[in-house]
């Protein structure tokens, strides 16, 4: 017996196509690219039917349904917009992922355009099915930092958002009797990492050993402008405290450390990371001007409680900044060798300041970043960390401030931040 002539489904075809179908003949129903066979609420690539002995087909011809990629996945620190009207998610529809500008930017600079493929997946030319990654934008404050042509020697009040990477690190070491409390500065490197000087995070309880303070004793404040008003600041506890393994307390060689924050901090106008330099041993060139910010909390008689809780006046309640020129290694070395004492300015350090002195150099709290504008990338880069000063401390004539040369440690920093020991797998832009 012959079976009735078959009509192929819309957006589909029947194979083989014959004038007559007899008992035991089989046909395969398939759909055009971007469509799938829909039968009994089931979706399949092809569907086979057979001409039965009684002249009827074993099943009805199924329909061809357009492939639907479904709602696109959300993007961390990004958003998705539909290029097609009515927010269509079907075959050949387009969407565009973008990052939360200006705080995040897309890794690999991809277009972020994804098309709904015939396979039912959102696909990008470069990344294929993988989602783009939004990385924090570093070294680009929402407010432009002052141009570096003028020599501003004295400390200035920083406007909110000028130094969005600036962190206040508060340490309360309860292993001491009474509890020991102190401050330092740091610089945000990513949503979860703070760069600082090792001596800020070293417990002074034991002298000839470098013992980091317990992570439980560390609090980091970000987006802080005035220590009397912490309402707008983000405070975070530490997940890990990592001192450079070769930190030397005798001469402060390798004075660099990292704090991993317990939770990633949300970035915004007042909280943004600083860029790391390229790994090169030269460090910043002499006469280059850099900026250092700090609250100038250098009065040992002021306790943490007074500042953090009641906001008692310190050297400065409001974040200050100062502009300083890099000094040649030879000049700095000579200035320290001419003084009594075994001060060693190593290759892991550089100096900055003015020959004529000026207490402005005090404004950079220990661990704060000495930042220089990189003309090539148009980003601010952390070239140094406030480390130490001579016996006269800051501001004396021909006693330069000594900074950790960050470019010597870039590989170590990346290694630590991306090590399996890191609490989370965190990506930061290199």
């Amino acid at each position: 017996n012959e079976c009735p002539k078959l009509q192929p489904p819309v957006y589909g075809k029947i194979e083989p196509s014959q004038a007559v179908y007899s008992f035991k003949d089989q046909v395969l129903v398939s759909c055009d690219t971007g469509y799938k066979v829909l039968k009994d609420n089931g979706v399949m690539d092809t569907f086979q039917i057979e001409c039965l002995k009684d002249g009827a087909w074993s099943n009805k011809i199924p329909t061809c349904k357009i492939v639907d990629c479904g709602a696109p996945a959300g993007l961390k620190h990004g958003l998705v917009t539909f290029s097609t009207r009515n927010n269509l998610t079907t075959y050949k529809s387009e969407i565009r992922y973008s990052c939360q500008q200006p705080y995040y930017k897309m890794l690999h600079n991809t277009t972020g355009v994804y098309t709904c493929s015939a396979h039912g997946t959102w696909t990008n030319e470069v990344l294929k099915r993988s989602l783009p990654t939004c990385l924090p934008v570093c070294g680009q404050p929402s407010r432009a930092l002052p141009n570096l042509v003028k020599r501003i020697i004295g400390g200035r009040n920083a406007e909110l958002g000028l130094f969005p990477w600036q962190a206040l690190i508060v340490v309360e070491d309860t292993s001491r009797v009474p509890n020991d409390k102190w401050f330092g500065s740091g610089a945000l490197l990513s949503e979860s990492w703070i760069l600082t000087a090792a001596h800020v995070l070293r417990s002074q309880r034991r002298d000839n050993t470098v013992i980091p303070v317990s992570k439980e004793h560390v609090t980091v404040y970000l987006g802080l402008h005035d220590v009397r008003d912490k309402s707008g600041a983000v405070n975070s506890s530490a997940a890990r405290v990592i001192l450079h393994p070769d930190f030397n307390i005798q001469n402060y060689n390798h004075d660099i450390a990292l704090v991993q924050l317990q939770k990633p901090v949300p970035l915004g106008a007042h909280v943004m990371p600083i860029c790391l330099p390229r790994p090169e041993p030269e460090g910043p060139a002499p006469h280059m001007l850099g900026l250092v910010a700090g609250w100038g909390i250098s009065n040992p008689n002021v306790t943490v409680d007074e500042i953090i809780l009641s906001g008692t006046r310190t050297l400065s309640d409001v974040l200050q900044y100062v502009k300083l020129p890099v000094v040649s290694h030879a000049e700095c070395k000579a200035s320290y060798e001419s003084r009594s004492g075994n001060y060693s300015v190593t290759e892991n350090m550089f100096c900055a300041g003015y020959y004529e002195g000026g207490k402005d150099t005090c404004l950079g709290d220990s661990g704060g970043a000495f930042v220089i504008f990189d003309e090539m990338s148009q980003h601010w880069v952390a070239q140094g960390l406030v480390s130490w000063g001579g016996p006269e401390e800051c501001g004396s004539k021909q006693v330069y401030g000594v900074y950790t040369k960050v470019s010597n440690y870039v590989d170590w920093l990346w290694e630590e931040m991306n090590s399996p020991r890191a609490v989370r797998d965190l990506q930061v832009e290199r």
Epitope: K181, H199, Q204, R206, D207, N251, N299, T303, P391
Partner: antibody, heavy 116, light 112 residues
Framework: QIQLVQSGPELKTPGETVKISCKAS????????ITWVKQAPGKGLKWMGW????????TYADDFKGRFAFSLETSASTAYLQINNLKNEDTTTYFC?????????WGQGTSVTVSS | DIVMTQAPLTLSVTIGQPASISCKSS???????????LSWLLQRPGQSPKRLIY???KLDSGVPDRFTGSGSGTDFTLKISRVEAEDLGVYYC?????????FGGGTKLEIK
């Protein structure tokens, strides 16, 4: 080259205040704490306590809580011991020494005499 | 407070002969960090004390190797293999493990 230089001898009357200085040189002052030690004439050494030179937080032994105060002038790399309301039993030599637990370099000592 | 007991109070030694000083603490000086904070100091007549040994057995730079420190827990010893004239003075042991830190009463080394 590491040195701790203390201020000179003091002669005081009971009830007065004395402030002894200890100037450090040859190392980064804020790297090490400063410990204060008392030595009565012909007697042994007594640990009075120490001050963290980075945080400025002092720690006192029980016998030295109250009238005794440790302080710092970080910019001058100097630590101070102040004794208020002096008593005759405060007549002794006071030493400053580097570190909280190092005690590796010592000042020359400052002799305080309390006499009416 | 930890009591540090030194013995003997006085030690008379002939130059070139060995000497040994004992220091006992009322509690173990092993710290939670695995280190034992026990130092030996020498105070020569009319001078400030000078550290000779730290962490039980580590010799300070410039200290002659005739000095050796040993011990653990609560019992510690300072030995001088051959006493020299410059060694006379009062020797103190000191513990920096338990707060408040404490000195021993001192041992006076005399030359016979």
């Amino acid at each position: 080259q590491i040195q701790l230089v203390q201020s000179g001898p003091e002669l005081k009357t009971p009830g007065e205040t004395v402030k002894i200085s200890c100037k450090a040189s040859g190392y980064i002052f804020t790297s090490y704490g400063i410990t204060w030690v008392k030595q009565a004439p012909g007697k042994g050494l007594k640990w009075m306590g120490w001050i963290n030179t980075y945080s400025g937080v002092p720690t006192y032994a029980d016998d030295f809580k109250g009238r005794f105060a440790f302080s710092l002038e970080t910019s001058a790399s100097t630590a101070y011991l102040q004794i208020n309301n002096l008593k005759n039993e405060d007549t002794t030599t006071y030493f400053c020494t580097r570190g909280g637990d190092a005690l590796d370099y010592w000042g020359q000592g400052t002799s305080v005499t309390v006499s009416s | 407070d930890i009591v540090m007991t030194q013995a003997p109070l006085t030690l008379s030694v002939t130059i070139g002969q060995p000497a040994s000083i004992s220091c006992k603490s009322s509690q173990s000086l092993l710290d939670s960090d695995g280190k034992t904070y026990l130092s030996w100091l020498l105070q020569r007549p009319g001078q400030s004390p000078k550290r000779l040994i730290y962490l039980v057995s580590k010799l300070d730079s410039g200290v002659p190797d005739r000095f050796t420190g040993s011990g653990s827990g609560t019992d510690f010893t300072l030995k001088i293999s051959r006493v020299e004239a410059e060694d006379l003075g009062v020797y103190y042991c000191w513990q920096g493990t338990h707060f408040p830190y404490t000195f021993g009463g001192g041992t006076k080394l005399e030359i016979k």
